[in-house]
Interface confidence: low
């Protein structure tokens, strides 16, 4: 038999200890939140908030401007000064809870933990390719804010998620805040609200619609808002909350909340339980039917998918899919599965399940005993009755009240447990050619860029590298500018190319040339690299013969 070269084991064809240096910025304190802006005249910026300060960076992470956002009561606080002469409330540090772009103006809106959670609007002032912030406007009108009714109290110190939607000439802020009894009593933020930014930038219009955890449940029932996004006709919030109102705090699970993006109303507020599981190929004896549950969402991102993954998910290429990283939760017993799993929920399918849930609740014949749910927000009732009523009302429609859909949406880990001990703390998904790539940050300060494919029994890495030596967890917020993603870890912001930081971690020519085309890898004498790194011959088509 003819002699053949021995095969190089797959794991030996790559080295994830290879060091990559990516551009970074030291913010001078723990990065709290971050957002990017790309204008239509090639101007762009990265906005980075730390305690008491907001940095404006260029796309190259060079500092353009810095603004003092606290401490409240300090004469050096530049945002506080926009509210006129104080005092405006208790003094103290400002932790930025909300940093979002208002696309219509355009402007940056920041909301902090101080000054009753009020927000500041910073008009964007393009100067060449750089962006500066104009003097801030204080989004607070003292005369129409009271402790029990405060349209301008937006951010909760326990965490707030905001998505901004343009409706006609107005900008609406879809706001979701975590509450407890103390926060609810101090400056009355709401759990979920839709607030219209006043045209004169003096705050938010009074009389806004809102849902709040009922006072009797505030102590035991806390909702963490993990992510929010807008796609199609809806705004979505993702939450981690107790599975039961009566057993709260108890076991946690994940829900998707859907709100209309075309109507600033909460009558069509819907919730759906998201169920993510790890289902090993061979089920161990005693392992749960349907797979091991991973009920707690850590991070999420929605993105259109490439052709390959779309085929595996039985959806059309380019359709929007919600990706979530889930963990098992504290009370899940001894873990035999991976630390993190990733599940994919096509948005169209989520919408259909919600619409079907409305149909079950509101279309006759209604299944007896079907509850409307959301008893932490509203009085208990059975379908099709409105909350708190024991019979349908002739003047009101069943569909015009919040509803928890009675079925959950169950998916299994896309990675088949292959993330193993990796603890994922950040996620951003992109479509590159016909491939869908998950860009993940980890608890030990690494970046994993992995092709999303369901059918493989190994991970298709674009890269797996350490951001630095600090080993600090990569934070939840990830932003994109052009062909780069911005991750934060500790007090640093890092710029990571979507195509990966390089090719040097591929050790063999065969492995190098099998890398995805978008990575731009080629064989360069005795190493894998990109063409500009190779002074000599660079080959993408075939490998030299092994001697």
């Amino acid at each position: 038999k003819e002699w053949q070269c021995p095969r190089t084991p797959y794991a030996a064809s790559r080295d994830f200890n290879v060091k990559y240096m990516v551009p970074s910025f030291s913010a001078g304190g723990l990065v709290q939140t971050m957002v990017t802006y790309q204008g239509d005249k090639n101007e762009s910026a990265v906005f980075v908030a730390i305690r008491n300060r907001l940095h404006v960076l260029g796309p190259d992470l060079k500092s353009v401007q810095s603004l003092a956002t606290g401490p409240a009561g300090d004469p050096g606080c530049q945002t506080c000064a926009a509210c006129g002469p104080g005092p405006h409330g208790p003094s103290g540090d400002t932790d930025t809870k909300v940093l979002v772009l208002e696309p219509a103006l355009p402007a940056l809106v920041s909301c902090g933990s101080s000054l009753q959670g009020r927000c500041f609007l910073h008009d964007l002032d393009p100067q060449g390719t750089a962006v500066h912030l104009a003097a801030p406007a204080c989004l607070f009108s003292a005369h129409h804010n009271r402790p029990d009714d405060c349209p301008d109290c937006v951010a909760s110190p326990l965490g707030t998620r905001v998505t901004v939607v343009e409706q006609g000439q107005a900008s609406y802020f879809y706001v979701a805040s975590s509450l407890d009894a103390a926060v609810a009593a101090s400056f009355s933020p709401r759990s979920v609200s839709i607030r219209r930014l006043k045209a004169d930038a003096s705050g938010f219009a009074p009389g806004f619609v809102a849902l709040s955890v009922l006072p009797k449940h505030l102590v035991s029932y806390s909702i963490e808002y993990v992510h929010s996004f807008h796609t199609g006709a809806f705004v979505y919030f993702l939450t981690v909350q107790p599975a039961s109102v009566t057993d709260a705090p108890g076991a946690l699970h994940t829900r998707l909340a859907r709100l209309s993006a075309t109507e600033p109303e909460l009558g069509d507020y819907r919730e759906l339980v998201l169920d993510c599981r790890f289902a090993p190929k061979r089920r161990r004896r005693g392992a749960p039917e349907g797979g091991q549950p991973y009920p707690v969402l850590r991070v999420a991102h929605s993105a259109p998918v490439g052709a390959q993954l779309a085929t595996e998910l039985s959806i059309a290429e380019g359709q929007e899919v919600l990706f979530g990283v889930f963990v098992a939760g504290k009370d899940s017993g001894p873990g035999v599965g991976p630390n993190s799993v990733v599940c994919a929920f096509p948005i169209d399918l989520l919408d259909t399940l919600i619409d079907e849930g409305v149909e079950r609740c509101c279309e006759s014949p209604v299944h007896p005993g079907l509850r409307r749910g959301l008893d932490f927000f509203q009085s208990p009732s059975f379908c099709p009755n409105p909350p708190g009523l024991e019979a349908p009302s002739p003047n009101t429609s069943c569909r015009h009240f919040p509803l928890l859909v009675s079925s959950s949406f169950s998916r299994v880990d896309l990675f088949n447990g292959l993330l193993g001990t990796v603890e994922v703390t950040a996620l951003y998904v992109t479509r590159l050619d016909n491939v869908t790539v998950a860009h993940m940050g980890t608890a030990d300060g690494r970046i994993l860029q992995v092709e999303l494919a369901r059918s493989l029994n190994y991970l298709l890495y674009v890269s797996n590298f350490s951001l630095g030596d600090s080993g600090q967890p990569v934070q939840r917020d990830v932003s994109r500018l052009g062909d780069h993603l911005f991750f934060a870890s500790g007090d640093q912001v890092f710029q990571v190319p979507i195509q990966g930081p390089g090719c040097r971690h591929f050790l063999t020519c065969g492995r190098c040339l099998r890398a995805q085309r978008f990575m731009g890898c080629g064989w360069c004498g005795n190493m894998c690299g990109r063409q500009k790194e190779c002074p000599g011959s660079w080959q993408q088509d075939h490998c030299p013969p092994k001697l």
Epitope: A233, F234, S260, T262, E263, E265, G267, D268, I315, P346, D348, L349, D351, T352, L353, D355, E356, V358, S397, R399
Partner: antibody, heavy 123, light 112 residues
């Protein structure tokens, strides 16, 4: 019982705007459902034009581009069609109809129709 | 847009005899929720259309059970087991799975 009644001019000149009204009785246009306009050309071809939902959001057939809009007057329980820059090709019988309550689509077909109003576009 | 093709365009029948109309769509009408939004409408002479069948096979209230609908994916059929005089008119299929909603060209059911 739910009833829909179309009304408007039977004759419109080319390049002018066509405005039609659909008056609904037996149901409130804010209570549920999508309220649609459909037209039938000579020769019987039917075309779905668009809807306004119970909440006031609208959805239009892309083939009508930006010439077409639907509005409503909830106090009169009416919804309206406006078609701008009409040509002879817009001559048809125009129907209003009630659809399902889905956000994206008019739901499972059209259960209730008006009797239709014939519109002729001619100089 | 989804094209709905009906055959035949005219169907001549005798009262009391069965009739069958076919409707084919240019793409599958199966929606992601497992439902197929295919409807059949009848337009009697001088009247507005009236829905007979929705979700492929569900009869509207008041529609006689001599009407039945069947099919899946892209191929659908409306059957009348015994034609009566009141059944004469033009039958249309309508899809509401995909945006925009589209109708078939119609099948005229007339007396032989």
């Amino acid at each position: 019982d739910v009833q829909l009644q179309e009304s408007g001019p039977g004759l419109v000149k080319p390049s002018q705007s066509l405005s039609l009204t659909c008056t609904v009785t037996g149901d409130s246009i804010t209570s549920d459902y999508a309220w649609n306009w459909i037209r039938q050309f000579p020769g019987n071809k039917l075309e779905w034009m668009g809807y306004i939902s119970y909440s006031g959001s609208t959805s239009y057939n892309p083939s009508l581009k930006s010439r077409f809009s639907i509005t409503r007057d909830t106090s009169k329980n009416q919804f309206f069609l406006q078609l701008n820059s009409v040509t002879t090709e817009d001559s048809a019988t125009y129907y209003c109809a009630r659809g399902g309550f889905y956000y994206r689509y008019a739901g499972p077909g059209f259960a209730y129709w008006g009797q239709g109003t014939l519109v002729t576009v001619s100089a | 847009d989804v094209v709905m093709t009906q055959t035949p365009l005219t169907l001549s029948v005798t009262i009391g005899q069965p009739a069958s109309i076919s409707c084919k769509s240019s793409q599958s009408l199966l929606y992601t929720n497992g439902k197929t939004y295919l409807n059949w409408l009848l337009q009697r002479p001088g009247q507005s259309p009236k829905r007979l069948i929705y979700l492929v096979s569900k009869l509207d209230s008041g529609v006689p059970d001599r009407f039945s609908g069947s099919g899946s994916g892209t191929d659908f059929t409306l059957k009348i087991s015994r034609v009566e005089a009141e059944d004469l008119g033009v039958y249309y299929c309508l899809q509401s799975t995909h945006f925009p909603l589209t109708f078939g060209a119609g099948t005229k059911l007339e007396l032989k």
